[in-house]
Every structure is written in C-alpha cells, then in structure tokens.
C-alpha cells in the first residue's frame, strides 16, 4: 500500500473537519469519513489543494476512519487515523 497521510487543517473544530489527504503518486477522487461508533460513511467535500472537508450539525466524534478512491482507481480504508484529540496542523499516517 503506497504511503498515505492525513493533515488536519486550520479551521477544523468540533463541527468542522478539514483534512489534507496525500497519497503517494496519486490524487484523491472521493474521500469518505466514518465517525467513531457510526455505521455510516459520509462523503467529504473536495476543496482546493487536496483538502477535504465535512460539516456536521452535531459535534464530530473521533477517532476518525477514512476510505477513499483515487483518480487511478485505488481503493483503501484506514481506521482510527485521526485521533479524537487531534492537533491542528498535525499530520497523521496509518499505523503499521
């Protein structure tokens, strides 16, 4: 699996999550989020520069799981990548 990283961007708060998703040699086509304890995947919105955002009416519950499709057709899923108590500007990589 090529290296993937998730950077929590400025402006993220309890009801807004903005994540820069980088995938070695490829570009994200779709990114989805699943909150801790949730059964449902929800689509994130693509912004500028590879930043993906999600807005919620209720406080978001971490740690956060992500799955994605890339422009080259790669599909992957990562559990608990971004912790509940994340740091703005921090870059998180899936544990190996």
């Amino acid at each position: 699996v090529p290296k993937v990283t998730f950077t929590v961007e400025k402006g993220s708060n309890e009801k807004h999550l903005a994540v820069l998703v980088k995938y070695e040699g490829d570009t994200m086509a779709e990114v989805e989020l699943r909150e801790h304890g949730s059964d449902e995947w929800v689509a994130m919105t693509k912004g500028e520069g590879g930043v993906w955002t999600f807005d919620s009416e209720e406080p978001l519950q971490g740690p956060f799981n992500f799955r994605f499709l890339t422009e080259k057709g790669m599909k992957n899923v990562f559990d608990d990548v971004v912790p509940e108590k994340y740091t703005i500007g921090a870059t998180y990589a899936p544990e190996e």
Epitope: V77, E95, E96
Partner: antibody, heavy 114, light 105 residues
Framework: LESGPGLVKPSQTLSLTCTVS??????????WSWIRQPPGKGLEWIGY???????YYNPSLKSRVTMSVDTSKNHFSLRLSSVTAADTAVYYC??????????WGQGTLVTVSS | ELTQSPSSVSASVGDRVTITCRAS??????LAWYQHQPGKAPKLLIY???SLQSGVPSRFSGSGYGTDFSLTISSLQFEDSATYYC?????????FGQGTKVEIK
C-alpha cells in the same frame, strides 16, 4: 486460504483461520472480512477485523462472533459460538478495501451436526 | 435491504442480459456487483455502481445511483453462467442482494 474443522457439533464453537498470501496484513489499508453462504441461500457478511484489532460485527451475529488477527503469522481468525444447524454454510474470508470485497478465499464448508 | 430482479434468467449466447438491484434507501453510488460460479470464489465485477474492476471483460457494465442500479452483460458468453450479487457499502453491515442466477439456453 481458509482452514478449520469441516464438522462442528451443535452448541460448540466454530473456529476458522484465514492465511493471507501476497501481501502483509500489517501494511494496512484493508478490512479483513468473513462472509458465509448457507446451502441454497445468499451471501451474508459476518464482519471485519482491521490490522490494529478494530472489529465490526454484523448485529445479527454480534453476540456470538469473535474475530482476531495475528500480524506476525499474517492470518486472521473467526470464532462463532453456540452454533446450530442454521450456521451450516460455506465460510469465505476476503479482503475489503472499504467499498468492495476484492479478493476472496476459495471458501470452506462447515457443517453443524451431531 | 437490497432486492434483485429477476431471481433467475435464461438467455442465449450473444444475448443482452440486464439484472436490477433496488436499495430500500439511498446508497449514493456505493454498490458493487459480483459473479459467483459453483465451487469458486466470488469475483468482483463492478464497484462504485459503474466502475469496471481491472481484468473484467468490457461486456460487463453497471449503472445507477441512489436506489436503482443495474448490471448489464452486453453479449452473453458461456462462461458467464453464474449467480450475480449486488452489495451495498454505504453503511454497516454491508449487505448483499439475494442473487440472480443466469443460465445459458
């Protein structure tokens, strides 16, 4: 590749192991799943385990299912307790990318009978 | 819940065959199709409703969004005799349709 007893007695525990080849479970990016198909019926997704040990079990089986993973042996396992004849099925292990089940084992028939 | 129709279909080599899958609630485009032949492992054909999995013949195609989806085999071949299943990946637990058996006349 699934392995385990083909015959289990009612009320006992069904145990299966899936050994992964051609890649490391530890590298992440996938859910390691179990699916079953009772004779003459459709496919039922049992649940998944992630390399970290995170699990999700189908609510219909949750009270009886336990999954585990051993990254050092590159395998993952399924335990289903208190089995009945209704648990007789072909059991498949599969790799999931979060959207699909993109690689499946050949499946193993487990019969529950005394 | 996913409902497939028809439950079985018999067609001739070269025929166009279409199978439908209806979701009880909207699942966006998170639907996959599998081919399952007796004694073999199920094989992924289509993901994200319409994307062809690598290595799958181009006679297979998928379409749909929300609640209504279809799988089409544009020109049926002998080796396409199998049971076909749809599967949703919108939310857990991931579920399958009941299957459609395709037979060659």
């Amino acid at each position: 590749l699934e392995s385990g007893p083909g015959l289990v007695k009612p009320s006992q525990t069904l145990s299966l192991t899936c050994t992964v080849s051609g890649g490391s479970i530890r590298s992440g990016g996938y859910y390691w799943s179990w699916i079953r198909q009772p004779p003459g019926k459709g496919l039922e997704w049992i649940g998944y385990i992630y390399h970290s040990g995170n699990t999700y079990y189908n609510p219909s089986l949750k009270s009886r299912v336990t999954m585990s993973v051993d990254t050092s042996k590159n395998h993952f396992s399924l335990r289903l307790s208190s089995v009945t004849a209704a648990d007789t099925a072909v059991y498949y292990c599969a790799r999931s990318d979060g959207y699909t089940l993109d690689n499946w084992g050949q499946g193993t028939l487990v019969t529950v009978s005394s | 819940e996913l409902t497939q129709s028809p439950s079985s279909v018999s067609a001739s080599v070269g025929d166009r065959v279409t199978i439908t899958c209806r979701a009880s609630q909207g699942i966006s485009s998170w639907l996959a199709w599998y081919q399952h032949q007796p004694g073999k492992a199920p094989k992924l054909l289509i993901y994200s409703a319409s994307s062809l999995q690598s290595g799958v013949p181009s006679r297979f195609s998928g379409s749909g969004y929300g609640t209504d989806f279809s799988l089409t085999i544009s020109s049926l071949q002998f080796e396409d005799s199998a049971t076909y299943y749809c599967q949703q990946a919108n939310s857990f637990p991931y579920t399958f349709g009941q299957g459609t058996k395709v037979e060659i006349k």
